[in-house]
């Protein structure tokens, strides 16, 4: 099972001091954002128990394996379901904590109920504040059952669930009608997928016999040990105040685990820590009781004394859960509760035993999960013990499970079960990723998803030129770092593959799929210089450049011209895709702008040194619009236009351009030049009679300027159809008759 614990601090005098902490003992837990471990998640689950919205809760991460939820402002914030999610991939596990209000109308006698498939579960809600009304039971938020208030037994409302099945699992609640849902008694029912003492897909496998209140997991047969106990069968007690699968975690605060509720992966659920009991886990065990929730009884024999955290403490000469075994009976010594090996390895397993008479090599045997018995190949006999060594045949996945070391002498026998985990070396599912490339190096990210088991201890990157038969080059890197492959050949394809390893002998996995990574071209080294440039218009610039003469072929694919407009902070780039080109026309520039200009040779994606920069000023754009344009009909075919010269001219006007268009017409407009720029009047002739026309005009210096306003005018009536408009200009002070 995943080593994941959700701790709830139940000192409830002040909700602001309440906190929930999720602790993971998994390797690489909670690192997030990398390929080796998703983060721990800790949140309130409002899907079933909804509480009034309040300020958001604060999540604080303490290192990679711990996350804490705080910021509860009022007691109602605490009521409901909280969950912590940890572990990676198929081992991703959710641990659930259900919090009841101490002031509720109904309180659960026991919050977590773990039962076997087919059992009868009984949920008991104790009356705390009586109401003479029905009690509604809900399952996962939906109506389930009604009890009349007369049906209370000894101040309790009982919900009996016969023949429970796994789908019956979930959150149950008991609530008085017309009472706030926050006053409900909330329960968690966990139904194991198998009957008592069984596990596995068809429930065909036998559980190891979990001790001290441990619960056999119905999927993998492992014991989920209560807080404060460890070992394959939960046979060992942790030191006071410690928890976690290896007793590696310590309860916070000076009073140890007092006032803390511990929630572990299903099918365990939640309980107080070892040595504590009560709804708020603040009461020490009564004499003769020990363990989580003080559920266990010592019943020590032969002078043993009861410790509320660990159970019987035996006097010398005795051992066993109740001090019932004499030290003369043979005893397996210091057997690890869990061993890990890699697939297809042939490990050596040691098993040590003591006793009177003294165990010899033939009296110690090793039994595999399939029942195969291995005899030791050699034994080391020391004054206080005999250590038998077993050479294990090549391991297969089916060897995962509970192995047993057994010693038999005339004084009796002892056996110790231990878990063997056969791990599959990791194999990359994808090729490594190219991050950046240069002409002689590649930067590669080796982090890829993989099949098999972690944690990843080393990453090997194998590479060689594509289509080469030479040996692979290998570089060993830290799993979390990117790799730089150096001293490569330019413009060359390399085949690159990842190989992952996990700890232990035979932990190297097969090579992952190859990928082709190509180094960049050589950098161009020649520096061009600008020969010259000239302006071909207000927005056009002709540029020419040269390159130094060097022997050999030119290393380059083309040129990059860069124009920098410092005023606007804008850069214009122009690509000239021929390495033979030595001139370019730049168009669409901004008139009246001061540019800094340079040119660079490029090769593939690499740029060579830039030429010394040149500074170019483009002439400004055309003049402003003519002012006060006016149209006046003179006859059935003539209209006179008058205007005033534009203001603030940047230079002398070379001409005016008039645009003539029939109002509402669909045809193209006609443009007429007025070539005497000093004039402020012109007559447009050859127009159609009784026709409405639109006019506008603009001036030209080096370029055309802005259009004036548009004016409308109609010719006088009933003339003949004209051939088309023409123009005659006069200075405004001249007479108009000819």
């Amino acid at each position: 099972a995943v080593d994941l614990t959700l701790l709830a601090n139940l000192r409830l005098t002040d909700p602001q001091r309440f906190f929930l902490t999720c602790v993971s003992g998994e390797a690489g837990a909670g690192r997030g954002s990398d390929a080796w471990g998703p983060p721990l998640l800790l949140e309130k689950d409002d899907r079933i128990v909804r509480t009034p919205p309040g300020p958001p809760l604060r999540l604080a991460r303490n290192g990679s394996h711990q996350v804490t939820l705080r910021g509860f402002s009022k007691p109602s914030d605490l009521v409901g379901v909280f969950s912590c999610v940890g572990g990676a991939g198929a081992r991703r596990t959710r641990v659930i904590y259900v919090h009841n209000s101490p002031g509720a109308h109904l309180l659960p006698d026991k919050v977590t109920h773990t039962v076997n498939k087919g059992d009868t579960a009984v949920l008991s809600a104790r009356v705390h504040k009586e109401k003479q009304t029905d009690v509604i039971w809900k399952s996962n938020g939906s109506y389930f059952y009604t009890l009349d208030w007369h049906e209370a037994q000894d101040g309790r409302f009982l919900l009996q669930l016969p023949n429970v099945q796994p789908p019956s699992s979930g959150i149950y609640s008991a609530t008085y009608l017309e009472a706030s849902p926050l006053g409900s008694a909330f329960f968690r029912l966990i139904v194991r997928g198998c009957g008592a003492g069984r596990w596995g897909p068809g429930c065909t496998k036998e559980c190891p016999g979990c001790l001290h209140g441990g619960v056999c997991h119905d999927h993998d047969g492992e014991c989920v040990c209560p807080p404060g106990f460890t070992g394959t069968r939960c046979e060992q007690a942790c030191r006071e105040g410690r928890f976690g699968q290896s007793c590696q975690e310590q309860c916070p605060g000076i009073s140890g685990c007092r006032g803390l509720t511990f929630c572990l992966p299903d099918p365990y659920g939640c309980s107080c820590g070892s040595g504590w009991r009560g709804s708020q886990c603040q009461e020490a065990c009564a004499p003769g009781h020990f363990g989580a929730d003080c559920r266990l009884q010592c019943q020590c024999q032969n002078g043993g004394t009861c410790d509320r955290f660990s159970g019987c403490v035996c006097p010398s000469g005795w051992h066993g859960v109740h001090c019932e075994k004499s030290d003369r009976i043979p005893q397996i010594l210091n057997m690890a509760s869990e061993l890990e090996f890699n697939l297809e390895t042939m490990p050596r397993i040691n098993c040590a035993a003591a006793g009177n008479p003294f165990p010899v090599r033939g009296s110690i045997e090793l039994r595999k999960p399939d029942g195969t018995v291995l005899l030791s190949t050699k034994a080391i006999v020391e004054p206080e013990k005999t250590t038998a060594e077993f050479e294990v045949p090549r391991l297969v996945l089916a060897d995962s499970g509970f192995w047993e070391c057994r010693v038999s002498t005339s004084g009796g026998q002892d056996s110790r079960r231990f878990k063997v985990n056969v791990k599959v070396p990791p194999v990359p599912l994808a090729a490594p990723r190219l991050l950046t490339k240069q002409s002689r190096q590649l930067v590669v990210s080796p982090l890829v998803s993989f099949s098999g088991d972690g944690p990843i201890s080393t990453v090997r990157l194998h590479y060689r030129p594509q289509d080469s038969t030479m040996d692979w080059s290998t570089i060993v890197v830290d799993p979390s770092e990117n790799v730089t492959l150096m001293n490569l050949r330019p413009k060359t394809g390399y085949s690159v593959r990842v190989q992952l390893s996990r700890p232990g002998e035979g932990g190297e996995g097969a090579w992952g799929p190859p990928t082709l990574m190509t180094t960049d071209c050589p950098e161009p080294l020649l520096q061009p210089w600008l020969e010259g440039w000239h302006v071909e218009g207000t927005d056009r610039l002709r540029v020419s450049w040269s390159l130094p003469l060097v022997p050999g072929p030119l290393v380059g694919d083309g040129f990059l011209l860069r124009l920098w407009d410092g005023t606007r902070g804008q850069e214009r780039r122009e690509n000239v895709s021929s390495p033979q080109a030595r001139t370019a026309l730049l168009t669409g520039l901004t008139p009246g702008t001061h540019y800094q200009l340079d040119v660079q040779l490029y090769h593939c994606t690499l740029l060579g040194p830039a030429s010394p920069p040149a500074h170019v000023l483009l002439p400004p754009s055309g003049p402003p619009a003519p002012r006060h344009l006016h149209a006046q009909a003179l006859s059935d075919s003539e209209i006179q236009l008058t205007w005033k010269h534009p203001e603030a001219l940047p230079g002398p006007i070379s001409k005016y351009v008039v645009e003539v268009q029939v109002a509402g017409g669909a045809g193209d407009p006609l443009w007429i030049d007025v070539d005497r720029p000093e004039e402020t009047s012109t007559i447009i002739r050859g127009l159609n009679a009784s026709t409405r026309y639109l006019f506008r005009m603009r001036a030209s210096i080096q370029g055309l300027g802005d259009w004036s306003n548009t004016v409308e005018e109609s010719t006088l009536g009933n003339g003949l159809q004209a051939e088309g408009p023409v123009q005659e200009s006069r200075a405004a002070e001249e007479g108009l008759d000819q």
Epitope: T133, D134, Y143, T146, D148, L177, E178, A179
Partner: antibody
Amino acid sequence: EVQLLESGGGLVQPGGSLRLSCAASGFTFSRYKMHWVRQAPGKGFEWVSSIVPSGGWTYYADSVKGRFTISRDNSKNTLYLQMNSLRAEDTAVYYCARQMYYYDSSGYYVGRFDIWGQGTTVTVSS
Amino acid sequence: DIQMTQSPSSLSASVGDRVTITCRASQSINTYLNWYQHKPGKAPELLISAASSLQSGVPSRFSGSGSGTDFTLTISSLRPEDFATYYCQQSHSISTFTFGPGTKVDVK
């Protein structure tokens, strides 16, 4: 389909007895509080009796107390009303109904009759 | 016991009319009031729970309001299938349930 079907009605003389049945289908009968409601000709509805899911507690209207007995058989998904000492004023169409609870954010509300049967007619006449 | 009264006892209306029925409890029942529709020879149908909560599948032209002792059922635009008798029912007492005498809505 969720359904209630009453049966057992008929013509009976004053002082006589009759047993009504209500067969439930389409839902888990054993989890719900059940009721009998009647409607006399030309009159409104009158609640008659109710029984809790376990069958262990019952309630009656004053007008039928001591004469009528409500019961249920959860294994047969059936509700019963045993009517003794019948009177002319017991003449009515008798309906069985399922009680459900309306829930909103402020808490639970007591019964509404969300499923009704089509009714069975009881006539008490000499 | 809580007594329920309804008014009017009957009303005639046309399709498209807005119809309002009132129900009064002899003592405060909070919002613990349900409305039912009944057509002859059919099972009664629950329309509204808890004074104002429309039952799933009931058309939105039906609405309920009120709290304490005075309650209202409104049909915003009467349809042909709405001609029936309407009953209010208190659910404040958990052991006994009383109905109003009913309001018959028929064609004008």
